[in-house]
């Protein structure tokens, strides 16, 4: 219909149109993570704030139990940033017992889970070797892309090491999606 | 059609629809920064090119005095990349007097200012410790996410050290926003 | 209004509206690169998967010979992530003959080509000095922004060194664009 006067008559049928304001959207922000048991060879999922501060879900996009639930099939832009930090101090709150706080690498994965399919699909991965020299290091990994999702799909963010995630500020670590 | 009842025939009432082409949008690109005095504990704001080369503002999205002005309430995708660079050479143009050119960290913040609220809101932060070994180092920090903004809100990009911002190319350092 | 006949009366004229689902969109994913001869001072372009796995093109957005073809003028969000990796092992598959595998820098450029003009326009650049200490290193560069494109424009992704691109997983290295 581009560049064309839009004055239809009663006889015509049009592609589905919708107000942009009623599309499913969510922006989730970091919270302090509770230690969770996770399976070997599977990165743990982060859980998120979905309604306080900058966080919101709208138009049937719901957040539950670490997952964003996709309420409507379509093409979505999905994004996340995770800020990692490591400190060599033994007393550091974010140091995980028995694990060296200077990892070889840091990784973020945005994963899609479809109930009818047993294996999760990795949509996006940001992975980085860590060769920081100083005692304290920190850095973000950002991801974002467009995917065709189906109603009922679930999205989550997995990280290589939850203990290294900076949960101190909502602007440092976040996760979002919106229907295009 | 914004804010207007969309009722073509007498029987039906529609949600407000609008042509995508008339939504507020902006992509700003880097310019050489003029040294500005900034308050202690507050990162300086960058100013931007808004109409030459790849830069543009459209549909009532205006740029003025380091701020993008939001002309209409709604959900916006906001993004920025800042490329930082440091050189150890004393004569380097981008070295700031009295400040070591190898910083401990580099930070970008996208900030929202609401006139009715005295304190700016940090929407997005990318922060990275710097442990570069060589004499010349450079690296980008990219940020992007969706936020609900109100008409009259103002957006700016703040950085930890203006003297380290690479202003040499419009594709290296930029800032944009568009109504979804 | 989704899924509903849109038949207003004759009296009113509307701005051009269109269903979001019929907008040009593409998400391309990495494939193993075939060595290509490239001109001095010009970064080589990546080629991409456009229909298997997570990759797709739709609504007249076509992929051909390393280029995304823009089928319709308008404002597009364009993004890419390239994951680079280097290994010091001589036998490494991704080591390029005669080239040290520890580069000084890694660079990604998203480039626009207009048929009527031989010189490409660089839209986005992510460039980073490499100072990794270990034998194996890897890291992503992410880019994304909005640009006004014309029907017939072509987009490609260029990198400083094809031999360092991680082509092992579709979620690590990708390229996409969608009409806003």
């Amino acid at each position: 219909l581009k560049g064309q006067e839009f004055a239809p008559s009663h006889q015509q049928v049009y592609a589905p149109l919708r107000a942009d304001g009623d599309k499913p959207r969510a922006h989730l922000t970091v919270v302090r993570q509770t230690p969770t048991q996770h399976f070997k060879n599977q990165f743990p999922a982060l859980h998120w704030e979905h309604e306080l501060g900058l966080a919101f879900t709208k138009n049937r996009m719901n957040y539950t139990n670490k997952f964003l639930l996709i309420p409507e099939s379509g093409d979505y832009f999905i994004y996340s940033q995770v800020t990692f930090r490591g400190m060599t101090s033994e007393s550091s709150e974010i140091r995980q017992a028995g694990r060296p706080n200077k990892p070889d690498s840091i990784t973020v994965v945005i994963t899609k889970v479809t109930d009818s399919y047993p294996e999760p699909t990795q949509l996006l991965m940001g992975t980085k070797s860590v060769s920081e020299v100083g005692s304290n290091w920190f850095q973000p990994i950002y991801l974002g892309a467009m995917f065709s999702l189906q109603e009922g799909d679930k999205l989550m963010v997995n990280v290589s090491d939850i203990s290294l995630v900076d949960y101190t500020k909502e602007d440092k670590t976040f996760f979002g999606a919106f229907l295009l | 059609l914004k804010g207007q009842e969309f009722a073509p025939s007498h029987q039906q009432v529609y949600a407000p629809l609008r042509a995508d082409g008339d939504k507020p949008r902006a992509h700003l690109t880097v310019v050489r920064q003029t040294p500005t005095q900034h308050f202690k504990n507050q990162f300086p704001a960058l100013h931007w090119e808004h109409e030459l080369g790849l830069a543009f503002t459209k549909n009532r999205m205006n740029y003025t005095n380091k701020f993008l002005l939001i002309p209409e309430s709604g959900d916006y995708f906001i993004y920025s990349q800042v490329t930082f660079r440091g050189m150890t050479s004393e004569s380097s143009e981008i070295r700031q007097a009295g400040r070591p050119n190898k910083p401990d960290s580099i930070t970008v913040v996208i900030t929202k200012v609401t006139d009715s609220y005295p304190e700016p809101t940090q929407l997005l932060m990318g922060t990275k410790s710097v442990s570069e070994v060589g004499s010349n180092w450079f690296q980008p920090i990219y940020l992007g996410a969706m936020f609900s903004l109100q008409e009259g809100d103002k957006l700016m990009v703040n950085v930890s050290d203006i003297s380290l911002v690479d202003y040499t190319k419009e594709d290296k350092t930029f800032f944009g926003a568009f109504l979804l | 209004l989704k899924g509903q006949e849109f038949a207003p009366s004759h009296q009113q004229v509307y701005a051009p509206l269109r269903a979001d689902g019929d907008k040009p969109r593409a998400h391309l994913t990495v494939v193993r690169q075939t060595p290509t001869q490239h001109f001095k001072n010009q970064f080589p372009a990546l080629h991409w998967e456009h229909e298997l796995g997570l990759a797709f093109t739709k609504n007249r957005m076509n992929y051909t010979n390393k280029f995304l073809l823009i089928p319709e003028s308008g404002d597009y969000f364009i993004y890419s992530q390239v994951t680079f990796r280097g290994m010091t092992s001589e036998s490494s598959e991704i080591r390029q003959a005669g080239r040290p595998n520890k580069p000084d820098s890694i660079t990604v450029v998203i480039t626009k080509v207009t048929d009527s003009y031989p010189e490409p326009t660089q839209l986005l650049m992510g460039t980073k000095s490499v100072s990794e200490v270990g034998s194996n290193w890897f890291q992503p560069i992410y880019l994304g922004a909005m640009f006004s494109l014309q029907e017939g424009d072509k987009l490609m992704v260029n990198v400083s060194d094809i031999s360092l691109v991680d082509y092992t997983k579709e979620d690590k290295t990708f390229f996409g664009a969608f009409l806003l």
Partner: antibody, heavy 124, light 107 residues
Framework: QVQLVQSGAEVKKPGASVKVSCKAS????????ISWVRQAPGQGLEWMGW????????HYARMLQGRVTMTTDTSTRTAYMELRSLRSDDTAVYYC?????????????????WGQGTTVTVSS | DIQMTQSPSSLSASVGDRVTITCRAS??????LAWYQQKPGKAPKLLIY???NRATGVPSRFSGSGSGTDFTLTISSLQPEDFATYYC?????????FGQGTKVEIK
Amino acid sequence: QVQLVQSGAEVKKPGASVKVSCKASGYDFTYYGISWVRQAPGQGLEWMGWISTYNGNTHYARMLQGRVTMTTDTSTRTAYMELRSLRSDDTAVYYCARENYYGSGAYRGGMDVWGQGTTVTVSS
Amino acid sequence: DIQMTQSPSSLSASVGDRVTITCRASQSVSSYLAWYQQKPGKAPKLLIYDASNRATGVPSRFSGSGSGTDFTLTISSLQPEDFATYYCQQRSNWPWTFGQGTKVEIK
């Protein structure tokens, strides 16, 4: 090669309008803005205005505000300048010029490619 | 609007002379100043952009300097083809504005 080719000379009566075209070739039309400059007989250069070929934004000289309109057609790579309510002192050679921009925050560039000029004569 | 004032309005010089033209802005234009050369019946030609950068193909005898409000165009050794009118233009703030021109004539 890079060039701007303007439409031919015009003779107009006072109160009429004139529309001058400027067709670009040899470069990415949407990247570089177009300025219009005029020169009355024996006088200096007068900057009239600028248009973004990228999205149509304009800036006009204060003296011409309300009388001048600049437009572009990206499909034909052509810029247009229309001047209304012509007066005898609008008699001049009208030039279009490409606004070079080096893609760098360090530079503003200059008008590096010029059309051949279009003579507009306003006479009753 | 920013006013641009050139001096002198005209000058006479001989081939081989060093010629200096100045341009003053009514307020700071940073380094956003261009210089143009125009010969009778021809379109102007860009010589210098951003105060001191020579445009493509411009001979090295042309140089520009200055920033803020005071700028200079220098022709180190005047050649026969340099006899023309020279204009400065500020590109700092809309509207762009030109100086009134300096005519360089043969002595």
